[in-house]
């Protein structure tokens, strides 16, 4: 019961996490503008992995997509790749984990197969979560680096043709969504891996067979002093586990002189 609960909870947590990773990837608020140095304070800039937007207090909003692929910063491309890999792995993990759920019966799937699938999905969730966390962290590092590099040059260059770096960006909501979602996916993956241990059978369960050499069951055969107490040669190579062995009542004994005493 605890295994099923752990597996089910791991699945739900991972599902929420992956939904969060997808949401974060699609969101435009990866970075938001700090407005302290603007003559028109009604302007708000925010940027995502796919487009840059401007919103004004008048209600005007405009977004422009990054249509070029080669011209974009390598960091942005890396973040995009990490997030997409995270989503793909997470989606595959979800698909695998659905079939691995103990509460869902599909044909005659054994627990060992379900355990393997649970472990596979768990690992996928862990990698997916790590990809998301890494992607968001790389982007956050890029923002911090840009912000501190720009602050020093903020007020220089009032002359003609002189440019001043005006990177006034701070962490957007998508970064926090991404971190939390990545963490949830990671936790869900760990839970799936823990559930896998409970699902996997430790050893093959042998049926208990009691053998004891009593006076009544010992047989003396000509040509050998061998007792047929079940320890004799297994001429038919019959499996003696999982129902193959005979119970105490079924052990065949040959008639001996003691039977007639």
């Amino acid at each position: 019961m605890a295994v099923t609960a752990c597996q089910g909870l791991g699945f739900v947590v991972s599902l929420i996490g992956i939904a969060g990773i997808i949401a974060a990837t699609c969101m435009d608020q990866w970075s938001t503008q700090d407005l302290y140095n603007n003559p028109v304070t009604a302007v708000f800039n925010y940027q995502g992995l796919w487009r840059s937007c401007v919103r004004e207090s008048s209600g005007f909003t405009e977004c422009r997509g990054y249509f070029t692929l080669l011209g974009l910063p390598a960091m942005l491309q890396a973040v995009r790749a990490l997030m997409i890999v995270g989503i793909v792995l997470g989606a595959i993990g979800l698909l695998v984990s659905i079939f691995a759920l103990k509460c869902i019966r599909i044909g005659s799937m054994e627990d060992s197969a379900k355990a393997n699938m649970t472990l596979t999905s768990g690992i996928m969730f862990i990698v997916s979560g790590l990809c998301a966390i890494a992607g968001v962290s790389v982007f956050a590092n890029m923002l911090v680096t840009n912000f501190w590099m720009s602050t020093a040059n903020m007020y220089t260059g009032m002359g003609g043709m002189v440019q001043t770096v005006q990177t006034r960006y701070t962490f957007g909501a998508a970064l926090f969504v991404g971190w939390v979602a990545g963490g949830l996916t990671l936790i869900g993956g760990v839970m799936m891996c823990i559930a896998c241990r409970g699902l996997a059978p430790e050893e093959t369960n042998y049926k208990a067979v009691s053998y004891h050499a009593s006076g009544h069951s010992v047989a003396y055969k000509p040509g050998g002093f061998k007792a047929s107490t079940g320890f004799g040669s297994n001429t038919k190579n019959k499996k003696i586990y999982d129902g193959g062995a005979r119970t105490e009542d079924e052990v065949q004994s040959y008639p001996s002189k003691h039977d007639y005493v």
């Epitope: 970075s31 503008q33 603007n38 003559p39 028109v40 009604a42 302007v43 800039n45 940027q47 840059s52 401007v54 004004e56 207090s57 008048s58 209600g59 005007f60 909003t61 405009e62 422009r64 990054y66 070029t68 011209g71 974009l72 910063p73 942005l76 890029m142 923002l143 840009n146 720009s150 260059g157 043709m161 440019q163 001043t164 770096v165 005006q166 990177t167 006034r168 960006y169």
Partner: nanobody
């Protein structure tokens, strides 16, 4: 390389009109706030007017009602229509643009033009 090129300056009589233009060129991704600033001889540079992408405007008190700022987002061009010019409007007018580049849309830059001289004299 991004360039802001101002044009339309010149000599005009008091009460006259002028229209300044500023064209931004280069690998620009998006221009946010654009503005006009001026610097009279021996004085600090001051804000004349600014405009956002959505056409929200802000004017210096000294030019309100006389100057009109406008822009064409598709052409990355800024305009300043100056009416009822006075002698105190004599200055070098600079174009200013807050923009980011296509090569790095996560960094914002402020670019300044070379300036165009407006002289109001009889």
């Amino acid at each position: 390389q991004v360039q802001l090129v101002e044009s339309g300056g010149g000599l005009v009589q008091p009460g006259g009109s002028l229209r300044l233009s500023c064209a931004a060129s280069g690998s620009i991704f998006m221009i946010n706030v654009m503005g006009w600033y001026r610097q009279a001889p021996g004085k600090q540079r001051e804000l004349v007017a600014v405009i956002t992408r959505g056409a929200s405007t802000n004017y210096a008190d000294s030019v309100k009602g006389r100057f009109t700022i406008s822009r064409d987002n598709s052409k990355n061009t800024l305009y300043l229509q100056m009416n009822s010019l006075r002698a105190e409007d004599t200055a070098v007018y600079y174009c200013n643009a807050d923009l980011n580049l296509a090569s790095d849309p996560f960094k914002w830059y402020t670019y300044w033009g070379q300036g165009t001289l407006v002289t109001v004299s009889s």
